[in-house]
Interface confidence: low
């Protein structure tokens, strides 16, 4: 439905508060280095303009597209060339090329200072002094660090952030009330950002068909009682929402997401019996709840898949007449029967089925050719099952920190060219799969673990894409979205790698390590571990364990010493010498 003024349409649909918040997010995700005050000024100008269009849709410039309006506004930033370099060249382009240009310059790892959390009293004072600015600052800081954060979901996080301060700043023990809530929001926020980053990578690198296939599988698992036509409609709508958000069209995205939540709740009888509670919530909570809702129970009497997809004489006819619909139905039918499989496994099975039909439907006897197609699924199913079993056993044996260390060593040996901070970040996240998924019963382990690993490996892929250093990473990241994890799993030690020169400075530590949080201290030790492996890729597990145990003892000893700095200097030299001897550096 055409509107005379798109900006007026979205302003009216979303309301002023959400409109302003979404424009701020959009601007901060594009111009990640701009100061907060500059963004607020731009947002206020856009909002005032939108209000004039609401009053009179025929007013000057009100008929312009949102990309044109927002792009023109971003291109008024005076320091664009100095701050962003070649991104300023985007402003010489016309829409839609200008927006595409801005999108290409989004930085997954912007050079921004780490967010340091002030004292609770300082935060509460700032919150009470100017609540609106305080909350805008939250949106700005998250959006600029996470340029693909799912904007309507960020509004939900901001609502929870506000609620935490409203409640805790009047509590007797503010810190005890607030800090756990902020930790939870931070951890959930990082997870949400990473999940959305995979959706955008899927759309942008592998296309709409890949995203739709993912959505068919996931929604069919979640809503197994819904019929195929229903799932198809939801997939179409969900694809539109995510395409818009990943493309920077945040107002349209938020508006369409609200419409989708409304549709789902109006039709929940046809979709899932698990939606009732979600649908009683206010909009932002409702959309979040629907996105996280548990899988509905599978219908009791689902017939065997073989009848329609292997035994039927019409398989090739049906496939030829509507390939994607037929494959979509296969994926839907398989996924609704298998909530115990990961989405990526289901997509591998569908790809195997498609490849088999492509080959067999051109054969002399198609039925004989594809009759055993389901047998080809067995090894594909067993591979992740075995891998998860082995890794959960290792996790239970080692605990999270040492399990992360095992993965750090494993991945550094596979792709030693990758930067140390990236290897530490990615391996730490890979290691979290243990505490996240191994506690689940067998039936929930694979969807938890393998789909989580897809999200984490995508982080490696997007960080590596910015500064490519390893052909092996590029290959695993680009060849097949659903086979990324098996591709990385299959990598052996990189025999072509020339070990890094030994640098004593890398292994020099100071007393400041003693005041770090446990997490920060772990990261320091894990950074040293990666560097060790880069120096000595052939080091055995036992050698590395011995060095790391010595290192932990050294840190503990010096942090208890009266003269910590002297201890770190003297004992550090001894440790480096002993480690060199142990590893033959």
């Amino acid at each position: 439905d055409a509107h005379k003024s798109e900006v007026a349409h979205r302003f009216k649909d979303l309301g002023e508060e959400n409109f302003k918040a979404l424009v701020l997010i959009a601007f901060a995700q594009y111009l990640q280095q701009c100061p907060f005050e500059d963004h607020v000024k731009l947002v206020n100008e856009v909002t005032e303009f939108a209000k004039t269009c609401v009053a009179d849709e025929s007013a000057e410039n009100c008929d312009k597209s949102l990309h044109t309006l927002f792009g023109d506004k971003l291109c008024t930033v005076a320091t664009l060339r100095e701050t962003y370099g070649e991104m300023a060249d985007c402003c010489a382009k016309q829409e839609p090329e200008r927006n595409e240009c801005f999108l290409q310059h989004k930085d997954d790892n912007p050079n921004l200072p780490r967010l340091v959390r002030p004292e609770v009293d300082v935060m509460c004072t700032a919150f009470h002094d100017n609540e609106e600015t305080f909350l805008k600052k939250y949106l700005y800081e998250i959006a600029r660090r996470h340029p693909y954060f799912y904007a309507p979901e960020l509004l939900f996080f901001a609502k929870r952030y506000k609620a935490a301060f409203t409640e805790c700043c009047q509590a007797a023990d503010k810190a005890a009330c607030l800090l756990p809530k902020l930790d939870e929001l931070r951890d959930e926020g990082k997870a949400s950002s990473a999940k959305q980053r995979l959706k955008c990578a899927s759309l942008q690198k592998f296309g709409e068909r890949a995203f739709k296939a993912w959505a068919v599988a996931r929604l069919s698992q979640r809503f197994p009682k819904a019929e195929f036509a229903e799932v198809s409609k939801l997939v179409t709508d969900l694809t539109k929402v995510h395409t818009e958000c990943c493309h920077g069209d945040l107002l349209e995205c938020a508006d369409d997401r609200a419409d989708l939540a409304k549709y789902i709740c109006e039709n929940q009888d046809s979709i899932s019996s698990k939606l009732k509670e979600c649908c009683e919530k206010p909009l932002l909570e409702k959309s979040h709840c629907i996105a996280e809702v548990e899988n509905d129970e599978m219908p009791a009497d689902l017939p065997s898949l073989a009848a329609d997809f292997v035994e039927s004489k019409d398989v090739c006819k049906n496939y030829a007449e509507a390939k994607d619909v037929f494959l979509g139905m296969f994926l839907y039918e398989y996924a609704r029967r298998h909530p115990d499989y990961s989405v990526v496994l289901l997509l591998r099975l569908a790809k195997t089925y498609e490849t088999t039909l492509e080959k067999c439907c051109a054969a002399a006897d198609p039925h004989e050719c594809y009759a055993k197609v389901f047998d080809e699924f067995k090894p594909l199913v067993e591979e992740p099952q075995n891998l998860i079993k082995q890794n959960c056993e290792l996790f239970e044996q080692l605990g999270e920190y040492k399990f992360q260390n095992a993965l750090l060593v494993r991945y550094t040996k596979k792709v030693p060219q990758v930067s140390t901070p990236t290897l530490v970040e990615v391996s730490r996240n890979l290691g979290k799969v243990g505490s996240k998924c191994c506690k689940h019963p067998e039936a929930k382990r694979m969807p938890c673990a393998e789909d989580y690993l897809s999200v984490v490996l995508n982080q490696l892929c997007v960080l590596h894409e910015k500064t490519p250093v390893s052909d092996r990473v590029t290959k695993c990241c680009t060849e097949s979205l659903v086979n990324r994890r098996p591709c990385f799993s299959a990598l052996e030690v990189d025999e072509t790698y020339v070990p890094k020169e030994f640098n004593a400075e890398t292994f020099t530590f100071h007393a400041d390590i003693c005041t770090l949080s446990e997490k920060e201290r772990q990261i320091k030790k894990q950074t040293a571990l990666v560097e060790l492996v880069k120096h000595k890729p052939k080091a055995t597990k036992e050698q590395l364990k011995a060095v790391m145990d010595d290192f932990a003892a050294f840190v503990e000893k010096c942090c208890k010493a009266d003269d910590k700095e002297t201890c770190f200097a003297e004992e550090g030299k001894k440790l480096v010498a002993a480690s060199q001897a142990a590893l033959g550096l």
Partner: nanobody, 115 residues
Amino acid sequence: EVQLVESGGGLVQPGGSLRLSCAASGFTFGSFGMSWVRQAPGKGPEWVSAIDSSGADTRYAESVKGRFTISRDNAKKTLYLQMNSLKPEDTAVYYCTIGRSTSRRNQGTQVTVAS
């Protein structure tokens, strides 16, 4: 977009007949088995009848066997349900589905059997 639109319902006396139609669009109708499902007031959905993609194989719930006939015209992308000897307990919203699911998304068509 996949769409299914039912029509042909109405008020009929016990023993009467009705013919329901379901017009399909947005997918290759001739490639898929189809079903009719019904939902009586205050009850869950009940599968009524199914037909394979070619129209050769038809199945019926015990409660309608011998009274209802499912058919299809792939050229017209339409599914039919001929209902004879209707009873008050056949009163329900009838809707068509792809495959053999009992979940509804489309509006359906109301059939009321009453004297």
